[in-house]
């Protein structure tokens, strides 16, 4: 019969390694995106990052982040996003709800969307790593 699997006990060092990898990849993405000159960040787009009512790593809004990055991948062929998505999937529960993103249609606005979300993603991964390491320190004290 089709039984649900035993809940996976994942060591914290694995989670930290995933987030460290995401942090590194987010910097690569941002560096790539910033090569486009004359594009300014927009106040119109906000990437969900950390949820205050959950413990790390479940406090990372991984499904929403995945949806935003998937949108960037469709707008601009950044292959680093493929690897980012694979790592985000390690943090996403298989029954997590889908997130719908409204995509800008104007070419320049698309570039602003890509830059803004890439910048926010990079900052988000810095925060996520901080929240993981501070959480780990609290757990040991």
């Amino acid at each position: 019969s089709h039984t649900l699997p035993v809940r996976l006990l994942r060591p914290s060092d694995d989670v930290q390694k995933i987030v460290e990898e995401l942090q590194s990849l987010s910097k690569m993405l941002l560096k790539d995106v910033e090569e486009e000159k004359g594009v300014l960040v927009s106040q119109n787009y906000t990437l969900p990052c950390l949820s205050p009512d959950a413990q790390p790593p479940n406090n990372i809004h991984s499904p929403a982040i995945r949806a935003y990055l998937k949108t960037i991948r469709q707008l601009d062929n950044k292959s680093v996003i493929d690897e980012i998505i694979e790592h985000l999937d390690k943090l996403i529960f298989q029954d997590a709800p889908e997130t719908n993103i409204s995509v800008p249609t104007d070419t320049h606005e698309c570039k602003r969307f890509i830059l803004t979300i890439s910048q926010q993603f990079s900052e988000c991964m810095d925060l996520a790593l901080k929240s993981l390491t501070s959480g780990a320190q609290q757990a040991t004290t």
Partner: antibody, heavy 122, light 107 residues
Framework: QVQLVQSGAEVKKPGSSVKVSCKAS????????MQWVRQAPGQGLEWMGA????????RYSQKFKGRVTITADKSTSTAYMELSSLRSEDTAVYYC???????????????WGQGTTVTVSS | AIQMTQSPSSLSASVGDRVTITCRAS??????LAWYQQKPGKVPKLLIY???TSAEGVPSRFSGSRSGTDYTLTISSLQPEDVATYYC?????????FGGGTKVEIK
């Protein structure tokens, strides 16, 4: 009960294409990656590629890039692997495999199709 | 691509022997490693996932462990029905490559 049923054996001429199907039943996951693997006679398992059926997102082994296309039809819970420009070295058993678990990313492939034998011969 | 180096490529042991098979990853892949058993003419069967978690219905004599980038599949007491080829596969990032396989035979 999860079942993966693959299409039947194929005999193909060099230079032609083959399309193998893999139909899943009893599988309730929404976010997952499934993979295609092949095994030439007397050889080991070789990873060909993967698909995230919900979005049609694909990943391919560098070895097969440009020759393999993996697709999925969500409405029929069927995945497909098409291999073109066939040569004799492509004679193998082709498998589809699906994961189980609580995350979207796999950490093992729990369910396997029965395999599809593809023979390439002139 | 991450390389998985599996050793030995074949081994012969007596019934009741303790058997160990190793896979070494070319870089850190965390616990994202699975072990499969494939009997002649059969479909691969998942034994261990996430480096050390046993799949449902797998006999307790099979276990997995990890030390850094080295992963070990242990059969604590080899049985005649364990004659098969064993493969490791990583899931850190695509391509999800396999080890070359270890053929286990009974002496």
């Amino acid at each position: 009960q999860v079942q993966l049923v693959q299409s039947g054996a194929e005999v193909k001429k060099p230079g032609s294409s083959v399309k193998v199907s893999c139909k899943a039943s009893g599988y309730t996951r929404t976010r997952y990656w499934m993979q295609w693997v092949r095994q030439a006679p007397g050889q080991g398992l070789e990873w060909m590629g993967a698909i995230y059926p919900g979005e049609g997102d694909t990943r391919y082994s560098q070895k097969f890039k440009g020759r393999v296309t993996i697709t999925a039809d969500k409405s029929t819970s069927t995945a497909y692997m098409e291999l073109s420009s066939l040569r004799s070295e492509d004679t193998a058993v082709y498998y589809c495999a699906f994961p189980e678990g609580q995350y979207a990313a796999p950490y093992g492939m729990h369910y396997w199709g029965q395999g599809t034998t593809v023979t390439v011969s002139s | 691509a991450i390389q998985m180096t599996q050793s030995p490529s074949s081994l012969s042991a007596s019934v009741g022997d303790r058997v160990t098979i190793t896979c070494r990853a070319s870089r850190n892949i965390g616990n994202y490693l699975a072990w499969y058993q494939q009997k002649p003419g059969k479909v691969p069967k998942l034994l261990i996932y996430y480096a050390k978690t046993s799949a449902e219905g797998v006999p307790s004599r099979f276990s997995g462990s990890r030390s850094g980038t080295d992963y070990t599949l242990t059969i604590s007491s080899l049985q005649p029905e364990d004659v098969a080829t064993y493969y490791c596969q990583h899931f850190w990032k695509t391509p999800w490559t396999f080890g070359g396989g270890t053929k286990v035979e009974i002496k």
